[in-house]
């Protein structure tokens, strides 16, 4: 009861002058506040309150539910309080079967006691079953029992108040505890695709999933540097408690070029945020563009193998791919694909594999791609290098010595003089003509080199070499001579090849 | 025992708005799901969205996305529902009830409110 | 969204007799299933959570049961009071109800 100190508002004295009354049941609750400045009675119990403005509160015939504090307050706010316990053997415990807690906090079992005196005020778990066992309670018969520290694994946990009653165990209604969960991690989002390529008309479709541990997460799909609301569709499930996903899907029906941008999907939590991006690429229409990854002018020794390679991106996808040569389509050795399985690839490969290539392949290879929107080429042109060949030697009706020889790249033909029997020739000899007989024919043949020196000038028995090179080798024939008194006779030529 | 106390029936016209309330007496208000469910005369039952007071963010079915906003005021334990371009289709008997989100069975019910959409 | 189907839509049945719904989900729920009972005028109220549950002051008579998609409400001997509609209802997904059966005296 309050103590007065002269001069200050007191609180209001109650009568009987204790903190806590049994009264049993079907018994009278007769209460009196003492107070010149009297306002009310209150009475509070499981979050019910019931108000009385008459200094003397009497209830009849008590019953249980009438068990809680009972508080009176003066006009200068100031009160006092008693608590009645009404004593119902057939009702141990007033209950509010709700029962939520939030993880990591306490949470209260609202179960209070109508009998202060039984023992054992305890929960227990429902059909015998155990309570889990780091669960720690404390009990308070006015209030209910507290469970400390809720834990997310007693989500759905069914258990009861108990307390013993003249040497009986006596179990209150179950409560089923249904535990929130604190967010301690942000939301993990992910996106179907991370970049779309579309051309105009087409439908834009991009899906976020979101996880996390309740479906109170925020989640919305943004346009980068745009306020605009997107319209978007959501599904969610539950795969278990604490496990929820939500798929939130973002539609364009018809894009458009300047619908091309980032879109982010951004979604938050109390602990914090996460997002993920897609970028959209509307495109007018299709293309395809081709780059080489060789140089598309190619040299390469007679014999030898290349292989002519390109990359190319194509959107839509590419619908015929061939390689040509001289008109003509190359039904193998050639192979094309994806440069990778991802799903949004658009760049691809094209190999075609020329293998000991002759001297008569050179010319111009071209690839040809197309797709539902255009076409796009690219060229080779091959040249295929070949060792000089001599193709005529003759002594003509002019008294000149003549050299024809056909190679890649054009043959240079130098002249030697050797006097009498010597094999070795070199006193070179300035020729008197030379042409290149097919410089206006085809491209990539051999080409043809022809070479004339005066056999006038020799005056002495020997041999005359015509020796044709060029980048990958050399080739050379003989002219052999043989003074007969003032007669020069051409001995039969001959040829020696030198690699 | 928690009871939820809806508000009176309302007649409203198409195109407007309607706001109805839903206030709890007692119990651990911001941490319960408490969801708006409606039945059209004769007909089923249809969940709307529902709050958990304590997160403050709403979940809606996807029918009424757009349409409809719960929110919920902890200091006087009270959701509300509004639902906004009303037609004549909207005519039914709006219930709260406690539950309805994270896997929570609706355990409670409000007697229900009468929205009548007529012009 | 997931759809429920409720079986059958109305029946006829008497006091004393076992009655059983059926309700089937348009994908697999695991077990969140609620059963409630709803009176003409009145709310619904809650009689089965979790499949096989039974709410605080339901009689024993009411029973649930079934997982995965397959699930039954069965009433083992009808009263007066139990005259209703009754709905089943699922929590995996957006909530869905089925249509409900109505359960009518003979």
């Known amino acids: 009861q309050p103590s007065v100190s002269p001069g200050e508002p007191s609180p209001p004295s109650i009568h009987p002058a204790k903190s806590e009354l049994i009264v049993r049941v079907g018994n009278e609750i007769r209460l009196l506040c003492i107070d010149p400045g009297f306002v009310k009675w209150t009475f509070e119990i499981l979050d019910e309150t019931n108000e009385n403005k008459q200094n003397e509160w009497i209830t009849e015939k008590a019953e249980a539910t009438n068990t809680g504090k009972y508080t009176c307050t003066n006009k200068h706010g100031l009160s006092s309080s008693i608590y009645v316990f009404v004593r119902d053997p057939a009702k141990l415990f007033l209950v509010d079967r709700s029962l939520y807690g939030k993880e990591d906090n306490d949470t209260l079992v609202r179960c209070p006691l109508t009998d202060p005196e039984v023992t054992s005020y305890s929960l227990k778990g429902c059909q015998g079953k155990p309570l889990p066992k780091d669960l720690r309670f404390v009990p308070d018969p006015k209030a209910g029992i507290t469970i400390k520290s809720v834990k997310r694994a007693y989500h759905r946990l069914c258990l009861h108040c108990s307390a013993d009653q003249e040497g009986k165990s006596v179990l209150s209604d179950k409560f089923i505890l249904k535990v929130r969960p604190a967010f301690k991690a942000v939301p993990v989002v992910s996106v179907s695709k991370a970049s779309y390529l579309l051309r105009e008309g087409e439908e834009f479709t991009v899906t976020c999933t979101i996880k996390d541990v309740s479906s109170s997460v925020y989640s919305t799909w943004k346009r980068e540097n745009s306020q605009t609301k997107l319209q978007e569709k959501y599904n969610s499930w539950h795969h278990g408690d604490f496990n929820y996903e939500r798929q939130a899907t973002l539609t364009i029906s018809s894009a458009r070029v300047n619908d091309s941008g980032v879109f982010m999907c951004y979604a938050n939590n109390t602990f914090g945020s996460a997002n993920v991006t897609t970028t959209l690429e509307v495109v007018d229409k299709g293309f395809i563009n081709i780059f080489p990854m060789i140089n598309t002018t190619v040299f390469v020794n007679d014999g030898e193998n290349v292989d002519l390679i390109v990359e190319y991106e194509a959107f839509p996808k590419p619908e015929h791919q061939q390689w040509i040569y001289m008109n003509r389509t190359f039904t193998d050795k050639w192979e094309d694909y994806p440069k990778s399985e991802n799903e949004s690839n658009i760049r691809y490969v094209s190999e075609l594999h020329l293998t000991r290539l002759k001297g008569t392949e050179g010319g111009t290879y071209t690839f040809l791609v197309s797709n539902s929107d255009v076409n796009a080429s690219i060229a080779f042109n091959v040249y295929v290098n070949t060792k000089p060949e001599i193709l005529t030697y003759d002594r003509l009706v002019n008294g000149m010595l003549q050299c024809v020889a056909a190679g890649f790249p054009e043959p240079t033909i130098d002249w030697y003089f050797c006097p009498g029997t010597e094999q070795r020739c070199s006193a070179s000899v300035l020729p008197v003509d030379v042409q290149t007989l097919n410089a206006s024919g085809p491209p990539f043949g051999k080409l043809v080199v022809q070479s004339s020196i005066d056999s006038s000038a020799f005056k002495h028995n020997g041999t005359v070499e015509c020796k044709a090179y060029n980048d990958v080798g050399k080739t050379s024939a003989y002219f052999n001579f043989a003074f007969k008194g003032n007669n020069k006779e051409q001995i039969h030529p001959h040829t020696l090849f030198t690699p | 025992q928690v009871q939820l106390v809806q508000s009176g029936a309302e007649v409203k016209k198409p195109g407007s708005s309607v706001k109805v309330s839903c206030k709890a007496s007692g119990g651990t208000f911001s941490l319960y799901a408490i969801s708006w469910v409606r039945q059209a005369p004769g007909q089923g039952l249809e969940w709307m969205g529902g709050i958990i007071p304590h997160f403050g963010l709403a979940n809606y079915a996807q029918k009424f996305q757009g349409r409809v906003t719960i929110t919920a005021d902890e200091s006087t334990s009270t959701a509300y529902m509004e639902l906004s371009s009303l037609r004549s289709e909207d005519t039914a008997v709006y219930y709260c009830a406690r539950g309805g989100l994270d896997t929570d069975e609706f355990d409670l019910w409000g007697r229900g409110t009468l929205v009548t959409v007529s012009s | 969204d997931i759809q429920m189907t409720q079986s059958p839509s109305s029946l006829s049945a008497s006091v004393g007799d076992r009655v059983t719904i059926t309700c089937r989900a348009s994908?697999?729920?695991?077990?969140?299933l609620n059963w409630y009972q709803q009176k003409p005028g009145k709310a619904p109220k809650l009689l089965i959570y979790a499949a096989s549950s039974l709410q605080s002051g339901v009689p024993s008579r009411f029973s649930g049961s079934g997982s995965g998609t397959d699930f039954t409400l069965t009433i083992s001997s009808l009263q007066p009071e139990d005259f209703a509609t009754y709905y089943c209802q699922q929590g995996v997904s957006d909530i869905t109800f089925g249509g409900g059966t109505k359960v009518e005296i003979k």
């Open positions: 994908q697999s729920i695991n077990s969140y």
